[in-house]
């Protein structure tokens, strides 16, 4: 029950996180015009990863896309790449995790397969979250650097009679959305990895201690109080569950008490 809840919660948290990463990537407000100690403009500038916008005092908003690819700063390209990689990995992770959910039964999929899929999706979510956090952090660092550079240049002009208005930019809403979303995806991934441990069928709960008796060997398994001879047809490992011991065949044939919520 706890495993299913952890897995389900991990999936939901990751889903919200990835939706947030997608939203942040598409948002225009990655950087917004700093209104403090700045020349008061009749327009409000803000920029995203894909276009820059201006909102006039009337409320009229106009955006222009970055139609060049080679002319863009390398850092911006890197942030775009990190966010896209994060989205792609997250989307694949979501797809994998849907099939890995314990509450969804697909044919005769073994618990070990579900455990592997849960682990895979968990790792994907973790990497996806890290990509988003890294992307947003790189952009934030770029903003901080540019902010102080433009502050230094604000009142110096351009050397001649004509001055250029230095519009300083500060953190936009998309950065906070990205950080939170990346964090949620990361947490969701960790939860999936934790759930994977609970899903994985352990070989034995305790290490078997073998006593070599004359004629045949008997492996005494304390805790389960089950003994298995070293001969005969029953050579499969016994797995000790809360509900008693079953062979692997039995595990597949009969649903355990953990299979349904």
């Amino acid at each position: 029950m706890a495993v299913t809840a952890c897995q389900g919660l991990g999936f939901v948290v990751s889903l919200i996180g990835i939706a947030g990463i997608i939203a942040a990537t598409c948002m225009d407000q990655w950087s917004t015009q700093d209104l403090y100690n700045n020349p008061v403009t009749a327009v409000f500038n803000y920029q995203g990863l894909w276009r820059s916008c201006v909102r006039e005092s009337s409320g009229f908003t106009e955006c222009r896309g970055y139609f060049t690819l080679l002319g863009l700063p390398a850092m911006l390209q890197a942030v775009r790449a990190l966010m896209i990689v994060g989205i792609v990995l997250g989307a694949i992770g979501l797809l994998v995790s849907i099939f890995a959910l314990k509450c969804i039964r697909i044919g005769s999929m073994e618990d070990s397969a579900k455990a592997n899929m849960t682990l895979t999706s968990g790792i994907m979510f973790i990497v996806s979250g890290l990509c988003a956090i890294a992307g947003v952090s790189v952009f934030a660092n770029m903003l901080v650097t540019n902010f102080w550079m433009s502050t230094a240049n604000m009142y110096t002009g351009m050397g001649g009679m004509v001055q250029t208005v230095q519009t300083r930019y500060t953190f936009g809403a998309a950065l906070f959305v990205g950080w939170v979303a990346g964090g949620l995806t990361l947490i969701g991934g960790v939860m999936m990895c934790i759930a994977c441990r609970g899903l994985a069928p352990e070989e034995t709960n305790y290490k078997a201690v073998s006593y070599h008796a004359s004629g045949h060997s008997v492996a005494y398994k304390p805790g389960g109080f089950k003994a298995s001879t070293g001969f005969g047809s029953n050579t499969k490992n016994k797995k000790i569950y809360d509900g008693g011991a079953r062979t692997e065949d039995e595990v597949q044939s009969y649903p355990s008490k953990h299979d349904y919520v």
Partner: antibody, heavy 119, light 113 residues
């Protein structure tokens, strides 16, 4: 038809006060920012003040800062300019102007009201 | 504050003639966000309030004859009247509508010879 009608102008002594009003019709007043612009007799245009549609942003020319106060009553479709500590150089025709939707332009102007500051 | 300087102060032209007047700002009026210049041109005929002619430095206001055109970017702007008509006699003002306080040029007076 967009109409802006200024009133409240007249003769006032230096140091005195005056309140100008602008009655607006023909458009949704509460959706537009408004300006006051003045023109001294025989001189050029001088921007005086701006108030945004929701009164969140208010700006003044340096020459009137601290003496003039712009306000608006969206329910009454009215714009106001409270002028205190008037000086001779404040003598001008005062225009009430709508801030345009595009380009931050000043698109509709009233006919103006004359304010004369003299002893 | 941004200083707007217009030239010439006045000019007299013949009917049908092409006329250009200039406006220079002390700071750039170009907004990188939408690649537009926040400069406006007005026409003020004697005894009348000003009338909006051009915004964004080059976009004609609706109802303005197409003989009026604006150009320029950054700090240097031009208003052109391709073929002057008698009704074009007026004072023409440029205005910075980018940075507060908004500032006007001193005006260019157009007369007919």
């Amino acid at each position: 038809e967009v109409q802006l009608v200024e009133s409240g102008g007249g003769l006032v002594q230096p140091g005195g006060s005056l309140r100008l009003s602008c009655a607006v019709s023909g458009f949704t007043f509460s959706s537009f920012g408004m300006h006051w612009v003045r023109q001294a007799p025989g001189k050029g245009l001088e921007w005086v003040a701006y108030i945004s549609s929701g009164t969140t942003n208010i700006y003044y020319a340096d020459s009137v800062k601290g003496r003039f106060t712009v306000s608006r009553d969206n329910a009454k479709n009215s714009l106001y300019l409270q002028m205190n500590s008037l000086r001779a150089e404040d003598t001008a025709v005062y225009y009430c102007v709508r801030s345009g939707y595009y380009g931050s332009s000043l698109d509709y102007w009233g006919q103006g009201t004359l304010v004369t500051v003299s002893s | 504050d941004i200083v707007m300087t217009q030239s010439p102060d006045s000019l007299a032209v013949s009917l049908g003639e092409r006329v250009t007047m200039n406006c220079k700002s002390s700071q750039s009026l170009f907004s990188s966000g939408n690649q537009r210049n926040y400069l406006t041109w007005y026409q003020q005929k004697p005894g009348q309030p000003p009338k909006l002619l051009i915004y964004w430095a080059s976009t004609r206001e609706s109802g303005v004859p197409d003989r009026f055109s604006g150009s320029g970017s950054g700090t240097d702007f031009t208003l052109t009247i391709s073929s002057v008509q008698a009704e074009d006699v007026a004072v023409y003002y440029c205005q910075n509508v980018y940075i507060y306080p908004l500032t006007f040029g001193q005006g260019t007076k157009l007369e007919i010879k």
